[in-house]
């Protein structure tokens, strides 16, 4: 059986649409799926790689690197995108390329980014893990740390940082899958919002999905203890 | 508001070692993205960037000078020194430090400069 | 090193008049920087990023150009505009800056 629930959110475009919410309810009325899988029932993705998800996961990185800023030109807000969803005409669309990009290091100057903007993420602006020296961030989006601690500055001057970021990244349903979006889109599908990181990539939804122990690397499932819990 | 100020001899004799400070205000040379440049211009001649200190202490010269040039911050009195060693005639020049900021800028650029200080070689 | 030829080297002009300043490296840069100099004073920056306008520079100035090739144009020349202009690169060290393109009154 399915229970489905309908209702006006905020998207990411910032205007409220009508959005449905299918759970799959429990044939024995008891907990949903995804509370069984926190109590550690034998769900296979938790214990070992499943190949479909692996795959998921690689599109999503995939999509990520080529994806830009999209602010609005209202002041409204900016989000992480695809070109094609940046609307040409009352947004615009943040993205490095043909030698338009910042250098990779102070210390390398003809080296340029290719990967990127991303919205309220930075290597010039970010202090904490600093870009610089033996740990200059790479220039590959998807392989972009967490930044913890943010130039004390109130503007930077930069379009894709001046901006207020409408969307981060959620994790959505029991197959980890990721989806940057507003915080109440992600609540009404009931899902994980990662209110410290700016993209996918910096976030192992799997790891929340299974809960319990954390893995040991966050990429790959070891819940063997799961054959015993249940 | 942003001051930088240049200070150091007027007049210095050749081979001597010439030392130059910049006082700046309004800015911390501890603030992330945040660094002072000098830069030279013989009188009536064009510019020509000598150094600058970035707020990491990670310092870059001018090769055609480096083993001249040695830079150098004091974040606590808000100083940035310049030295060069082996002062010759053809250094004569106005002299002058730079903030260098980032502010919307792919790059840096030298935003804010000081008035500047004319040092004379001669015997 | 990047170097930066500025020409003309120096020209005459009238207030109203629509001045461009060409501004070549010997080698391919990806932003220019342009300043701005009276006589016995410090420059000041008026471009940044090739074509971005600097905090209060007044919108009759404005930059362009990719490559080796970048433009500095005034739109209608003001008598506060007589000055010296140096384009310069941020592109390679060491930082380099053109001779200077010197702008007088006809």
């Known amino acids: 059986a399915q229970h489905v629930t309908t209702q006006l959110v905020l998207r990411n475009k910032g205007v409220y649409e009508s959005v449905k919410y299918i759970q799959q309810e429990n044939f024995w009325i008891g907990p949903s799926s995804i509370d069984l899988i926190h109590l550690g029932a034998k769900f296979s993705p938790c214990i070992r790689k499943d190949q479909q998800i692996e795959q998921l996961v690689l599109r999503e990185r995939d999509l990520e690197r080529d994806s830009g800023c999209c602010v609005q030109n209202d002041h409204s807000g900016c989000i992480q995108t695809q070109r094609k969803d940046c609307s040409e005409t009352l947004a615009t669309f943040v993205k490095w390329q043909d030698d338009t990009g910042p250098p990779m290091d102070k210390s390398d100057l003809g080296q340029k980014r290719t990967s990127g903007a991303v919205c309220h993420q930075d290597p010039r602006t970010c202090e904490e893990p600093a870009s610089s020296g033996a740990h200059i961030w790479p220039d590959d989006i998807t392989k972009w740390p967490i930044c913890t601690e943010q130039a004390k500055s109130n503007r930077t001057g930069f379009l894709h940082m001046d901006c207020q970021i409408k969307g981060r990244p959620c994790c959505i349903s029991t197959k980890g899958s990721c989806e940057i979006t507003t915080r109440e889109y992600c609540e009404f599908m009931h899902g994980y919002f990662h209110e410290e990181a700016t993209l996918c990539s910096q976030v192992h939804c799997l790891d929340k999905v299974c809960g319990l122990l954390p893995f040991l690397n966050p990429e790959v499932p070891d819940q063997f203890y799961r054959l015993w819990l249940s | 508001q942003v001051t930088l100020r240049e200070s150091g001899p007027a007049l210095v004799k050749p081979t001597q070692t010439l030392t130059l400070t910049c006082t700046f205000s309004?800015?911390?040379?501890?603030?992330?993205?945040?660094?002072v440049g000098w830069i030279r211009q013989p009188p009536g001649k064009a510019l020509e960037w000598l150094a600058h200190?970035?707020?990491?202490?990670?310092?870059y010269y001018n090769s055609a000078l480096k083993s001249r040039l040695t830079i150098s911050k004091d974040t606590s009195k808000n100083q940035v020194v310049l030295t060069i060693t082996n002062m010759d005639p053809v250094d004569t020049a106005t002299y002058y430090c730079?903030?260098?900021?980032?502010?919307?800028?792919?790059?840096?650029?030298?935003?804010?400069w000081g008035q500047g200080t004319l040092v004379t070689v001669s015997s | 090193a990047i170097q930066l030829t500025q020409s003309p080297s120096s020209l005459s002009a009238s207030v109203g008049d629509r001045v461009t300043i060409t501004c070549r490296a010997s080698s391919s840069v990806s932003y220019m920087y342009w300043y701005q100099q009276k006589p016995g004073k410090a420059p000041k920056v008026l471009i940044y990023d090739t074509s971005n306008l600097a905090s209060g520079v007044p919108s009759r100035f404005s930059g362009s150009g990719s490559g080796t090739d970048y433009t500095l144009t005034i739109s209608s020349l003001q008598p506060e505009d007589f000055a010296t202009y140096y384009c310069q690169q941020w592109n390679a060290y060491p930082l380099t800056f053109g001779q200077g393109t010197k702008l007088e009154i006809k």
């Open positions: 730079a903030r260098i900021s980032n502010y919307g800028s792919n790059y840096w650029y030298f935003n804010v």
């Open positions: 309004g800015f911390s040379l501890s603030t992330f993205g945040m660094g």
């Open positions: 200190i970035w707020w990491d202490d990670e310092k």
